[in-house]
Interface confidence: low
């Protein structure tokens, strides 16, 4: 059974109860490369941030290159998506309880800024996959995800005909594509410049207030 985010009283500055997350957010000076924007306040450790940049990292044994080499232009979005998932302390309003062996909580319908989704989709045009939902249905017999029998490798566009199909379908509706733009304070940015602070803090505050939770 699932209960809504409203069942949590701590929606701001929180870490999800999942496989690699810290129990509480805090500074992490040595966050690696694409995860570095979260240095000042993170739910991930430096070693998690280092590991998630690797192809088929030990975090989940997930292989981005399951249909041949994923273009770097595309892969950087999946790395950024993983940084957001592992490191962000600002996704409390969208945490849901789940009954899974590897995690007790997940995100649902995080309002991703429309430009971040559009860019992700465009940048992955030249890469290939064999599935439209990457949460389930893989062949894990080798210990690493492989395309299931009968699943053909095609361009991303074949499996994700629109930006929303990618961002919403990929991880079982962890994201929903917002109508709001980057910088609006009403949608979560996957990419941001930490020199200006973390724009997602304001977004979390807005949605937490809208849920009538302090």
């Amino acid at each position: 059974t699932m209960c809504s985010a409203q069942d949590r009283t701590d929606l701001l500055n929180v870490c999800m109860d999942a496989k690699h997350h810290k129990t509480k957010p805090g500074p992490e000076d040595k966050l690696h490369d694409q995860c570095s924007p979260w240095k000042k306040n993170a739910c991930c450790t430096a070693s998690t941030s280092q590991e998630l940049h690797k192809d088929t990292s030990r975090l989940y044994n997930f292989n981005w290159d399951h249909c041949g080499k994923m273009e770097p232009a595309c892969k950087r979005h999946f790395i950024q998506d993983t940084c957001l998932y592992e490191c962000s302390p600002n996704l409390g309003p969208w945490i849901q309880q789940v009954n899974q062996s590897w995690r007790k909580e997940r995100f649902l319908d995080v309002p991703l800024c429309k430009e971040d989704c559009q860019r992700w989709w465009e940048d992955c045009h030249t890469s290939h996959t064999c599935k439209s939902n990457w949460h389930r249905g893989w062949d894990w017999t080798s210990g690493v995800n492989k395309c299931p029998a009968g699943a053909l490798c095609r361009t991303f566009e074949s499996y994700f005909p629109t930006p929303a199909a990618l961002c919403e379908g990929l991880w079982s509706h962890s994201y929903k594509v917002s109508n709001y733009s980057r910088g609006s304070g009403r949608c979560i940015q996957m990419w941001f410049d930490s020199a200006q602070g973390n724009p997602n803090e304001e977004v979390a505050r807005f949605y937490a207030a809208a849920m009538h939770v302090n």
Epitope: R119, W191, D193
Partner: antibody, heavy 117, light 107 residues
Framework: QVQLKESGPGLVQPSQTLSLTCTVS????????VSWVRQPPGKGLEWMGA???????DYNSALKSRLSISKDTSKSQVFLKMNSLQTEDTAIYFC???????????WGQGVMVTVSS | DIQMTQSPASLSASLEEIVTITCQAS??????LAWYQQKPGKSPQLLIY???RLADGVPSRFSGSRSGTQYSLKISRLQVEDIGDYYC?????????FGGGTKLELK
Amino acid sequence: QVQLKESGPGLVQPSQTLSLTCTVSGFSLTSNSVSWVRQPPGKGLEWMGAIWSGGSTDYNSALKSRLSISKDTSKSQVFLKMNSLQTEDTAIYFCTRYYGYTYFAYWGQGVMVTVSS
Amino acid sequence: DIQMTQSPASLSASLEEIVTITCQASQDIGNWLAWYQQKPGKSPQLLIYDAIRLADGVPSRFSGSRSGTQYSLKISRLQVEDIGDYYCQQGQSNPRTFGGGTKLELK
């Protein structure tokens, strides 16, 4: 090996229409986006517009009213049409393949177009 | 449109010298910035993307950095083959816009 090659007339009369073709090889237009960039003699670069893999287009607003980009994926060709040419449209016209949605990773050799009577 | 202000417009440097070119964006573009090199009579070539990442085959003497909305391209030890024009380009939004260019010459 990725290659792009522009072709078209070297000289166009003022007020006439420019038609250029970009023929590509080493990649497919069904899964790659291509744009046009121009460079007036001795000057900088100007992005003109793009055609995305799905067929939709984006144009530089300064040129939008007289520019059209299309493609024939079966022939691996991208076309640029621009009407009402003036002398300030004299430039080298490049077609480029995107690195993702963001940068220009591969460039054609360019074609010099002079607008003059 | 996002304006990219590049400086200097031209630059004379000696072999093995350190060269720095900068680009100022008129608004926040995150890390969506590329640098290109254009040799005389040739097409531009992608050198650096995402502000700091080296494109394939580019020598390690080239590097990119960022401070807020200011971006820099550094050549650590100038070589003869580095002579040419350099352009920055923002990839944050359409229209994609370029800096005015920097002409790099040998002293």
